[in-house]
């Protein structure tokens, strides 16, 4: 028997904001003619389900967002590689929990300069997950303890910080006609998740009075 990692390796889910993409790599023996077929299943189920649109493909990724859409469920996926010469290898992922494993993207924020303040409005983050009534769930609806951390760099030594669950924030007491750097991150304490920051560089308006 051959070493299967010669043909196929690093089969794993890459998940961000509940978009769940299966990725893998060809091993050193992988050839351009190698084709890949993907199956998935839930925890404890006997049968693997072939993913339509990801059978005998040559690319090294497959979007399983719809098939893994129950974020309280545990899933597996596996890839079968068949080389041009007829060699085969099958590899499966570890148990995948979207709640546990998905990473958070930077939030979508609008930064509005005023004369002596900067307003920051965080927009709800949509996900590909549908609620029972058919609407798309937002991150805020999935993670009830989701919070935002907003920081405003005033100068090299001074930073203003706000934190909360609400969508609208305002930093007051700023100097007019001055540029500030704002960073906004989203975090979920219970799941030890924190996004990379959204960054906005804004200049307060000049004081016309």
């Amino acid at each position: 028997p051959e070493d299967l990692s010669d043909l196929l390796q690093n089969v794993k889910f890459q998940s961000s904001n509940f978009e769940n993409i299966l990725t893998w790599e060809s091993g050193p023996e992988g050839t351009p003619g190698t084709v890949y077929s993907i199956e998935y299943k839930t925890y404890g189920e006997r049968d693997w389900v072939a993913k339509k649109g990801c059978q005998r493909i040559t690319r090294k990724s497959c979007n399983l967002t719809v098939e893994t859409g129950n974020f309280t469920e545990l899933y597996y996926a596996r890839v079968t590689a068949v080389s041009a010469g007829g060699r085969t290898a099958t590899k499966m992922t570890d148990r995948f929990s979207a709640l546990q494993h998905t990473t958070l993207k930077p939030p979508d924020v609008t930064c509005i300069p005023k004369v002596r303040s900067i307003q920051m409005i965080v927009h709800p983050t949509p996900t590909p997950i549908r609620a029972g009534d058919g609407h798309w769930l937002t991150l805020e609806e999935i993670f009830h303890d989701l919070s935002y951390r907003l920081e405003l760099q005033v100068n090299r030594t001074y930073q203003m910080r706000l934190e909360g669950k609400q969508r609208e924030y305002e930093f007051f007491g700023l100097t007019p006609d001055t540029e500030f750097l704002g960073t906004i991150t989203v975090f979920v304490t219970t799941w030890f998740k924190e996004s990379a920051p959204y960054v906005c560089r804004v200049k307060t308006l000049p004081d016309r009075t």
Partner: antibody, heavy 116, light 113 residues
Framework: EVQLVESGGGLVQPGGSLRLSCAAS????????MNWVRQAPGKGLEWIGE????????TYNQKFKGRFTISVDQSKNTAYLQMNSLRAEDTAVYYC?????????WGQGTLVTVSS | DIVMTQSPDSLAVSLGERATINCKSS????????????LAWYQQKPGQPPKLLIY???SRESGVPDRFSGSGSGTDFTLTISSLQAEDVAVYYC?????????FGQGTKVEIK
């Protein structure tokens, strides 16, 4: 046809080590999880731990963590149970069993006797 | 750890009669994702490995005779052999796969009366 065959059991002195093998045939070992379960003479079943043979990720029953190690050689289609610091109470038939939740295929078992 | 307790420890049943084995878990085995119960039943004959009979508390494994059935939910489960045959003499185990470590009941020995 799926088959699991354990080997490597035998008599070992207290404090000794033993490595059990589980040779899988009829399927690729990397296609499903593999478990080790033991049964002391005349007693019930005890789950030792599992491995995802594709990734090497293991989960152990806390009772065995540190003394027992599960591994896989993909090229041999074989799983292993390395047992260290063996004690008399480790005397049992050791089974490998396939699947990730309950166990659909079992080997015939290999007897490990720990005695001086 | 979830403790699985079977009753009785042994039972003797006449050929063709019903055999009922109970299994109680120390916490609910209802898996919220699919509203199924994470419980399996095995049969073990002397000198043989266990054989899977039932999973998800009531799903019969392929090839298992339909006289074997599983029922129950939450913490209380039952394996029923509707008409005991001579070849059903064995020890029967329940197993939970709700959480690590997976645990088994102590076993119930079924004999012919």
């Amino acid at each position: 046809e799926v088959q699991l065959v354990e080997s490597g059991g035998g008599l070992v002195q207290p404090g000794g080590s033993l490595r059990l093998s589980c040779a899988a045939s009829g399927y690729s070992i990397t296609a499903e999880y593999m478990n080790w379960v033991r049964q002391a003479p005349g007693k019930g079943l005890e789950w030792i731990g599992e491995i995802n043979p594709s990734t090497g990720t293991t989960t152990y029953n806390q009772k065995f963590k540190g003394r027992f190690t599960i591994s896989v050689d993909q090229s041999k289609n074989t799983a292993y149970l390395q047992m260290n610091s063996l004690r008399a109470e480790d005397t049992a038939v050791y089974y490998c069993a396939r699947f990730d939740a309950y166990f659909d295929y079992w080997g015939q078992g290999t007897l490990v006797t720990v005695s001086s | 750890d979830i403790v699985m307790t079977q009753s009785p420890d042994s039972l003797a049943v006449s050929l063709g009669e019903r055999a009922t084995i109970n299994c109680k878990s120390s916490q609910s085995l209802l898996y919220s994702s699919n509203q199924k119960n994470t419980l399996a039943w095995y049969q073990q004959k002397p000198g043989q490995p266990p054989k899977l009979l039932i999973y998800w508390a009531s799903s019969r494994e392929s090839g298992v005779p339909d006289r074997f059935s599983g029922s129950g939910s939450g913490t209380d489960f039952t394996l029923t052999i509707s008409s005991l045959q001579a070849e059903d003499v064995a020890v029967y185990y329940c197993q939970q796969y709700y959480s690590y470590p997976f645990t088994f009941g102590q076993g119930t020995k079924v004999e012919i009366k």
